[in-house]
């Protein structure tokens, strides 16, 4: 999916409002040092293309984030405001889907959750290139 | 500290696929950063080609991308570039590199392919 | 695409003398701009990033400075494994990351 025209605007205030709170919670316990950033981001299709990919996809040591609170309300916001998103969206559907069944947080999990936080703080950069 | 190795056929035809791989010790794919292939020309400037992240996303230069796909193994440690329908303009040392989707920290020594018939 | 335009093409100068190398971008890449060293028959190093951060294991004599579309690397007092050439590199404009055509610093 193409990220260029997204509400840009409105995705940062829905993560300003709700998004961070959920990452900071799924974080509770764990210092802000504890995990190096690895990956960043260039602009704002790129942030968000790295944010979809990073929340959804199943990485190793860490099966899915898809069920957790901060992704079903990613997942809305992309959908609400990236138009066309949610016609793209129907495989990673099946993939939340059955990821509902297990809800462990490893700590492979907490280095992804700190990932994405670096990701969104980019994102919400206000120098930050629209496209 | 990590360590990238490049390898593949020094010499490939045109209209044929370029095909390298970049070994990576020290560090696993899966773990962190993206993965990303470099080229330069001989005598020329660097070009970036593209990334595979740890987690699997994936990035292409726009004006290779039609020709270009990038994968990884990461039960080998390994990550693999493509490059189809290769002319003489394609001739240059590629490198590997480790990213942070941004700039390249950690770059492998580089491997020439030349595109001859 | 953003073009990156590296100044002067060549750089002669003496070991302990001040290099000063400019890069200059088609268009604001705010401070989303890194260094590479390359020696002949070597990878490039990454020296800068972010426009004036040191990357580990940098010397000190190496420092960057700019934002927006002008930037420039210096080097306080050549060592003789300084001579080599320079890239530049915006990260302002995913996926069209572009290099500049490099400097040479070589002795005089």
């Known amino acids: 999916y193409d990220f260029t025209n997204c509400d840009f605007e409105k995705i940062k205030a829905a993560y300003l409002s709700t998004i961070s709170k959920d990452l900071i919670t799924y974080m509770s316990g764990t210092k802000s040092t504890e995990f190096n950033n690895t990956v960043s981001c260039s602009n704002r299709p790129h942030c968000l293309t790295e944010i979809q990919s990073l929340t959804f996809n199943p990485t190793a040591g860490c099966a899915s984030l898809a069920k957790e609170m901060f992704a079903m309300k990613t997942k809305a916001a992309l959908a609400i405001w990236c138009p066309g998103y949610s016609e793209t969206q129907i495989n990673a559907t099946q993939a939340m889907k059955k990821a509902r069944k297990s809800k462990v947080t490893t700590n492979k999990c907490l280095e992804q959750v700190s990932q994405l936080q670096g990701l969104w703080r980019r994102f919400n950069r206000p120098l930050l290139k629209q496209q | 500290q990590v360590q990238l190795q490049e390898s593949g056929p020094g010499l490939v035809k045109p209209s044929e696929t370029l095909s390298l791989t970049c070994a990576v010790s020290g560090y696993s794919i899966s773990s962190g950063y993206g993965w990303s292939w470099i080229r330069q020309p001989p005598g020329k400037g660097l070009e970036w080609i593209g990334y595979i992240s740890y987690y699997g996303s994936i990035s292409y230069n726009p004006s290779l991308k039609s020709r270009v796909t990038i994968s990884r193994d990461t039960s080998k440690n390994q990550f693999s570039l493509k490059l189809s329908s290769v002319t003489a303009a394609d001739t240059a040392v590629y490198y590997c590199?480790?990213?942070?989707?941004?700039?390249?920290?950690?770059w492998g020594q580089g491997t020439l392919v030349t595109v001859s018939s | 695409e953003i073009v990156m335009t590296q100044s002067p093409a060549t750089l002669s100068l003496s070991p302990g003398e001040r290099a000063t190398l400019s890069c200059r971008a088609s268009?604001?890449?705010?401070?989303?701009l890194a260094w590479y060293q390359q020696k002949p028959g070597q990878a490039p190093r990454l020296l800068i990033y972010d426009a004036s951060s040191r990357a580990t294991g940098i010397p000190a004599r190496f420092s960057g400075s700019g934002s927006g579309t002008d930037f420039t690397l210096t080097i306080s007092s050549l060592e003789p494994e300084d001579f080599a050439v320079y890239y530049c590199q915006q990260y302002s404009d995913w996926p069209q990351y572009t290099f500049g055509q490099g400097t040479k610093v070589e002795i005089k």
């Open positions: 268009q604001s890449v705010s401070n989303n």
């Open positions: 590199a480790r990213t942070n989707l941004l700039y390249f920290d950690s």
